[in-house]
């Protein structure tokens, strides 16, 4: 369970057309459900019910986004449509380059994600909790375009990784 170093860059545009970037760093863990490798993409927040269906006729969302999923307390979500691992798989099927789970309210999900899988996903599946999860929630609450970069070693300089 290696540390995942996540950098989130918020892009805030001004009326003149210029934009400012704000970088926030947080840490999570790579789970055994996925690969321990770097990934980068625009953040797309996945509703717990938004990963339930599997309609063949669906238009696939563009590839290369980072899915963020907040898990609820198990007792408040007694009949989820998919397991946590199933949700990760569905997100990757739909084009996610990585999935980040906020497990703050469902720490049992960590064990589910770390059960040795014979067929782990080829994309990273990261979990965050506590203060790091709060940071992430605050970012997606800001309603600005945001990109996440997940690395398995500490970032050197944020500007090194983002082509502005």
């Amino acid at each position: 369970k290696e540390t995942a170093f996540v950098e989130v860059v918020l892009f805030e545009s001004s009326p003149s057309g210029d934009y400012t970037t704000y970088t926030t760093g947080l840490t999570g863990r790579f789970s055994r459900a996925g690969a321990t490798l770097s990934a980068e993409g625009e953040i797309v927040q996945m509703h717990p019910l938004g990963l339930c269906n599997n309609n063949d006729e669906e238009d696939l969302y563009e590839y290369g986004w980072v899915g963020v999923v907040k898990l609820e307390q198990p007792e408040l979500d007694p009949k989820p449509c998919l397991t946590v691992l199933g949700k990760a798989k569905r997100a990757v099927q739909r084009g996610a380059t990585a999935v980040i789970f906020d497990v703050s309210e469902n720490p049992e999900a960590i064990d589910q994600l770390n059960q040795g899988s014979e067929d782990p996903l080829k994309r990273p599946v990261v979990y965050v909790k506590g203060a790091d999860a709060i940071k992430l929630m605050n970012i997606v609450n800001k309603q600005k375009v945001a990109r996440a970069r997940i690395q398995h070693r500490p970032p050197r300089q944020p500007t090194e990784y983002f082509d502005m």
Epitope: Q45, G50, N55, Y61, E75, L76, Q143
Partner: antibody
Framework: QVQLKESGPGLVQPSQTLSLTCTVS????????VHWLRQPPGKGLEWLGV???????DYNSALKPRLRISRDTSKTQVFLTLNSLQTEDTGIYYC???WGYGYNPFDHWGQGVMVTVSS | DIQMTQSPSFLSASLGDNITITCHAS??????LAWYQQKSGNAPELLIY???SLQSGVPSRFSGGGSGTEYVLTISNLQPDDIATYYC?????????FGSGTKLETK
């Protein structure tokens, strides 16, 4: 500031197709899911369907064969198409948004568009 | 599908009264309940979510409570601006069912 605005024809003939547009501003499809609901005259609210942040959709099972929801992210618009219209499809059609970080209610609504199905 | 049964359908009250509207779910919905207010000719507006959390900007005379299958919306010190129809709604599962509504009128 957050806005959702429905537009479309006020009158549609039976058996025809209804096409509505919801134009949104002040929030991102990356974080919010857009739902369609309707309200027959003098009656309660009925959920029709949703387009999730990832672009996939879910529909009310009773309407699924006739209903399609899509979007154009560049224009920040969501579309509803309902075919084989019947007089019972008359009502006010609303688009509304739902935050995707866990379970959340509909926190902003459009003002609605009245649709009458009549010959 | 989970059914939401709301009562009463009509409620007549005097300004200054405290009133209660109830919502019964056909199965345990774990508190994932919202209350909306709809004034004549307008779209619904969110009042309460997660059974008892007050939406930002909503006056504190509105409150929600309950758990399991039984939920209530209480309006304290009824004001003229509160005359509307109120709906409960579950939002943790399809098809996001609403109650049939309670139309509140003044005596």
């Amino acid at each position: 500031q957050v806005q959702l605005k429905e537009s479309g024809p006020g009158l549609v003939q039976p058996s025809q197709t209804l096409s509505l547009t919801c134009t949104v501003s002040g929030f991102s499809f990356n974080y919010y899911n857009v739902h369609w609901l309707r309200q027959p005259p003098g009656k309660g609210l009925e959920w029709l369907g949703v387009i999730w942040s990832g672009g996939n959709r879910d529909y009310n099972s009773a309407l699924k064969p006739r209903l399609r929801i899509s979007r154009d992210t560049s224009k920040t618009q969501v579309f509803l198409t309902l075919n084989s219209l019947q007089t019972e499809d008359t009502g006010i059609y609303y688009c509304t948004r739902m935050w995707g970080y866990g379970y959340n209610p509909f926190d902003h609504w459009g003002q609605g568009v009245m649709v009458t199905v009549s010959s | 599908d989970i059914q939401m049964t709301q009562s009463p359908s009509f409620l007549s009250a005097s300004l200054g009264d405290n009133i209660t509207i109830t919502c019964h779910a056909s199965q345990d919905i774990k508190g994932w309940l919202a209350w909306y207010q709809q004034k004549s000719g307008n779209a619904p507006e969110l009042l309460i979510y997660k059974a008892s959390s007050l939406q930002s900007g909503v006056p504190s005379r509105f409150s929600g409570g309950g758990s399991g299958t039984e939920y209530v919306l209480t309006i304290s010190n009824l004001q003229p601006d509160d005359i509307a129809t109120y709906y409960c709604q579950l939002y943790h599962s399809f098809p996001f069912t609403f109650g049939s509504g309670t139309k509140l009128e003044t005596k």
